[in-house]
C-alpha cells in the first residue's frame, strides 16, 4: 500500500480551478525528493504534466503550479481554467513516475453552468453585488414587478415594485425599472451572503399572463491563497477588494474555531496584542486596496487569514473578503536573533540584524515601529550615510560583522528609546527583523565626561573608563559621522579609579586630539568590541572654541557637563524628515535633496518574536 494519500475523486466544472493536496510521510528524504503530477495513459504509462523541479507541460502552461510544503508533508497542485479535456485519471507522487510512491486521482470536469432549463446562473463572490435581469412583455409594463426566492417548496417574496423589501435584505437590495425603451427590470443585491444563494424567480404581473424568469444564484466563498513563509520571516497580505469599498473600514482577521474571525488589525485602530511591534497596515490606495505586513513569524501565526471591508472593522455577513492559508516553515533559513535587547538610561545597545547573505550589497535600514493608527515605521538610519536629525551622534549602522549580519548601535539611551525597531533591507523582502529595546534600571558600564570644550590649536585628552568586566575586549575611540564611526588612536592609561569593587583589570583609555582644529568638533565614541562584534559605547560631544588661555586640556569626569538629551543642530544642517516606511514596497521620502537611490520592492527581515532570547546592552 502506498503511503501517499490524496483525493480519490475530484469533480469540477469547466472554467473552474481545482487545488489537489497530496499527503506524504514527511521524512527527510521525502521532503526533498521530486514531486510530480502525471496523467495516466490508456497503455499504463504516466505522462508528467508538472513537477517540483520546474517542469510544466505545454498543456498546463500558464494555468498550473505545484507547491511543496515539506514541513506539513504535503504538496499542492493547482490547476486553473479547467476544460472537459482535463477529465481523466492522474497520479500525484514522489520520486520517479513508475516507482509506486503515488496515489491515483480521478478528475471529472463537467459542462459549466449556463442557461439550464431557461434558468440564468449567476456566480458571484461573497460580499459582492449581483444584478438579476428580468425581461417582461409590453402588456405587463404597468403591472407589479417582483422577485421571489424559493425556500423549500414555497416562493418567498424578496422585493416588489410597490416598495416591499423582505427583512433579510433590508438596506442591501433595490429594484430598478429600466426606461420605457427597454422591457426589463433589474434587482440589485449587494453585500451578498452565503445564505442568499439559491433559486429565484422574477415576475412581471400577477395573473396567468405574467412573465416569469428563473435565476440560480451561487455565492462563492473565496478560495484561500496558500502562503508558505519561514519561521522568524515575514509575510505580506495584499488585499484588493475593489473601489466600491474604498471608503469602508478594512480589516485583517485570523479564523479561530468555527466561523469566528479574530481581528488582527483594522483601519479603526484595533490591533491584536500578539502582533504588537511586528505588524503594519499600509495606507490604502485610491482603489481601496491595502496590504498588511507581519514580521517575526511564529509557529502559532499559521492559519487562515481573511481581509475584508466592513464599517465595524471586523468580519460580518456580507463583508467582501479575500482569504489566505498561512503555513509557517519551521526549517527556517532565517537565523535566530535576540528579540529583546536591554540597555540602561545613559547607556547603549548594539543590535545584530540578519539579512540574506546573498544580498550583501543591498541597502540596510533601521526604523522605529510606531503603533499609532495602523502602525508605521519611520526610518532612523541607513547604510548609505543618512541618519535622522534627532539621532545625530548617537546612532550608527555598521556593515560589520557582514556575511548575513549588520550592526546598529544606539547610545545616550533615554526611556523614550524603549520600543520596537525593525531591521530591513531593500533586497529580500522576507528578511525583516523586529527587536524590542527595553530600558532597565542601572548605570552605564562605560564612564565618559559629558560635553567637552576643546581650544583651537591646543591638545585635548578625553578619558573613557572601562570596568574590569571588559578586560578581554578590544577598547577603542572613534569619531562619529553619518556613515559610521572612524577609529582613532587611543592610549591605555592603566587601571581606572572610577569603579568601586573593581580590580586592576579596569582600564582608563584616553583619546588625544593634538593641535585641535575646527574639523575636530563633533561626536566621539568610546566602546568595546570582540572582533567584528560590537558591545557597549559611550558618546562625548567635543565643541571647539577660540583660545582664551594657553595650555592643553585634560578633561576629568568631575569637570564634565551632563550630556544633553537633545542636541541643537546648527542651522546649516540638512534635515531629512518623514523618512518612513508607510508602504514596505516603497520607502516614502520627503526630502529637499534629490535622491535617486533605489528604494526597492519591499524590505523584509525577521526575528523570532516568540522566543525568550534576550540580549544585554553589550551585545555579546
Amino acid at each position: 500500500k502506498s503511503p501517499i494519500f490524496g483525493p480519490e475523486e475530484v469533480n469540477s466544472v469547466e472554467g473552474n480551478s481545482v487545488s489537489i493536496t497530496c499527503y506524504y510521510p514527511p521524512t527527510s528524504v521525502n521532503r526533498h525528493t521530486r514531486k510530480y503530477w502525471c496523467r495516466q495513459g490508456a497503455r499504463g504509462g504516466c505522462i508528467t504534466l508538472i513537477s517540483s523541479e520546474g517542469y510544466v507541460s505545454s498543456k498546463y502552461a500558464g494555468r498550473a503550479n505545484l507547491t511543496n510544503f515539506p514541513e506539513n508533508g504535503t504538496f499542492v497542485v493547482n490547476i486553473a481554467q479547467l476544460s472537459q479535456d482535463d477529465s481523466g485519471r492522474y497520479k500525484c507522487g514522489l520520486g520517479i513516475n513508475s516507482r509506486g510512491l503515488s496515489f491515483d486521482v480521478s478528475l471529472e470536469v463537467s459542462q459549466g453552468p449556463g442557461l439550464l432549463n431557461d434558468t440564468k446562473v449567476y456566480t458571484v463572490d461573497l460580499g459582492r453585488t449581483v444584478t438579476i435581469n428580468c425581461p417582461f412583455k409590453t402588456e405587463n409594463a404597468q403591472k407589479r414587478k417582483s422577485l421571489y426566492k424559493q425556500i423549500g417548496l414555497y416562493p418567498v417574496l424578496v422585493i416588489d415594485s410597490s416598495g416591499y423589501v423582505n427583512p433579510n435584505y433590508t438596506g442591501r437590495i433595490r429594484l430598478d425599472i429600466q426606461g420605457t425603451g427597454q422591457l426589463l427590470f433589474s434587482v440589485v443585491i449587494n453585500q451578498l451572503r452565503l445564505s442568499d444563494a439559491g433559486q429565484y424567480l422574477c415576475q412581471a404581473g400577477d395573473d396567468s399572463n405574467s412573465n416569469k424568469k428563473n435565476a440560480d444564484l451561487q455565492v462563492l466563498k473565496p478560495e484561500p491563497e496558500l502562503v508558505y513563509e519561514d519561521l522568524r520571516g515575514s509575510v505580506t497580505f495584499h488585499c484588493a477588494l475593489g473601489p466600491e469599498v474604498a471608503n469602508v473600514a478594512k480589516f485583517l482577521c485570523r479564523q479561530s474555531s468555527g466561523e469566528n474571525c479574530d481581528v488582527v488589525v483594522n483601519t479603526l485602530g484595533k490591533r491584536a496584542p500578539a502582533f504588537e511591534g511586528r505588524i503594519l497596515l499600509n495606507p490604502q490606495d485610491k482603489d481601496g486596496s491595502f496590504s498588511v505586513v507581519i514580521t517575526g513569524l511564529r509557529k502559532e501565526d499559521a492559519g487562515r487569514y481573511l481581509c475584508g471591508a466592513h464599517s465595524d472593522g471586523q468580519l460580518q455577513e456580507g463583508s467582501p473578503i479575500q482569504a489566505w492559508q498561512l503555513f509557517v516553515n519551521e526549517e527556517s533559513t532565517i537565523p535566530r536573533s535576540p528579540t529583546v535587547v536591554k540597555g540602561v538610561a545613559g547607556g547603549s545597545v548594539a543590535v545584530l540584524c540578519p539579512y540574506n547573505r546573498k544580498e550583501s550589497k543591498s541597502i540596510k535600514y533601521w526604523c522605529l515601529w510606531e503603533g499609532a493608527q495602523n502602525g508605521r515605521c519611520p526610518l532612523l538610519v541607513d547604510s548609505e550615510g543618512w541618519v535622522k536629525a534627532q539621532y545625530e551622534g548617537r546612532l550608527s549602522l555598521l556593515e560589520e560583522p557582514g556575511n548575513g549580519t549588520f550592526t546598529v548601535i544606539l547610545n545616550q539611551l533615554t526611556s523614550r528609546d524603549a520600543g520596537f525597531y525593525w531591521c530591513l533591507t531593500n533586497g529580500d523582502t522576507l528578511w525583516r527583523t523586529t527587536v524590542e529595546i527595553k530600558i532597565i534600571e542601572g548605570e552605564p558600564n562605560l564612564k565618559v565626561p559629558g560635553n567637552v570644550t576643546a581650544v583651537l590649536g591646543e591638545t585635548l585628552k578625553v578619558p573613557c573608563h572601562f570596568p574590569c568586566k571588559f578586560s578581554s575586549y578590544e577598547k577603542y575611540w572613534c569619531k562619529w559621522n553619518n556613515t559610521g564611526c572612524q577609529a582613532l588612536p587611543s592610549q591605555d592609561e592603566g587601571p581606572s579609579k572610577a569603579f568601586v569593587n573593581c580590580d586592576e583589570n579596569s582600564r582608563l583609555v584616553s583619546l588625544t586630539l593634538n593641535l585641535v582644529t575646527r574639523a575636530d568638533e563633533g561626536w566621539y565614541w568610546c566602546g568595546v568590541k570582540q572582533g567584528h562584534f560590537y558591545g557597549e559605547t559611550a558618546a562625548v560631544y567635543v565643541a571647539v572654541e577660540e583660545r582664551k588661555a594657553a595650555g592643553s586640556r585634560d578633561v576629568s569626569l568631575a569637570k564634565a557637563d551632563a550630556a544633553p538629551d537633545e542636541k541643537v543642530l546648527d542651522s546649516g544642517f540638512r534635515e531629512i524628515e518623514n523618512k518612513a516606511i508607510q508602504d514596505p514596497r516603497l520607502f516614502a521620502e520627503e526630502k529637499a535633496v534629490a535622491d535617486t537611490r533605489d528604494q526597492a520592492d519591499g524590505s523584509r527581515a525577521s526575528v523570532d518574536s516568540g522566543s525568550s532570547e534576550e540580549q544585554g546592552g553589550s551585545s555579546r
Epitope: E9, V10, N11, S12, S19, L194
Partner: nanobody
Amino acid sequence: EVQLVESGGGLVQAGDSLRLSCAASGRTGSSGAMGWFRQGPGKEREFVAALMWRNTVTYKYYEDSVKGRFTISRDNAKNTAYLQMNSLKPEDTAVYYCAADPDTYGDPRNSGAYDYWGQGTLVTVSS
C-alpha cells in the same frame, strides 16, 4: 452552531448494503468538509471517508480498506451527507460517526480537523 444527526445504522449480513445519513442543521456554506469515522469494539476511532467542497469543486477521500465498496456523497439542498456501504464485511462492524467542519484545510483523515461531531450510529455486520 452546527448539529449533526446520523441515521441508517443497523444489523446486516456480510455482503449486504447499508446507507448512512448525516443531517446537518445550520448552514454548511459554499465550502467545508464532512467525514465519516468509525470505532470498532476495543479499537481506536479511524477515518473511513470524507468529502470536501470548495464552491463548485468536490474532493472525495477514502480509507484503503473501503475503496471500491463505500461511496461518500452529499445533497447540498438537504444539508445531508451519505455513506453508501456495499459488500459489507464483519470487520466493518463499528459505531460510525459523522464529522463536519465549515472550513477545513487540514488533512481530512485527521479527526482534529473537524469542529462538529454526531453522536454515532451502530453498524453490525454478522457473518
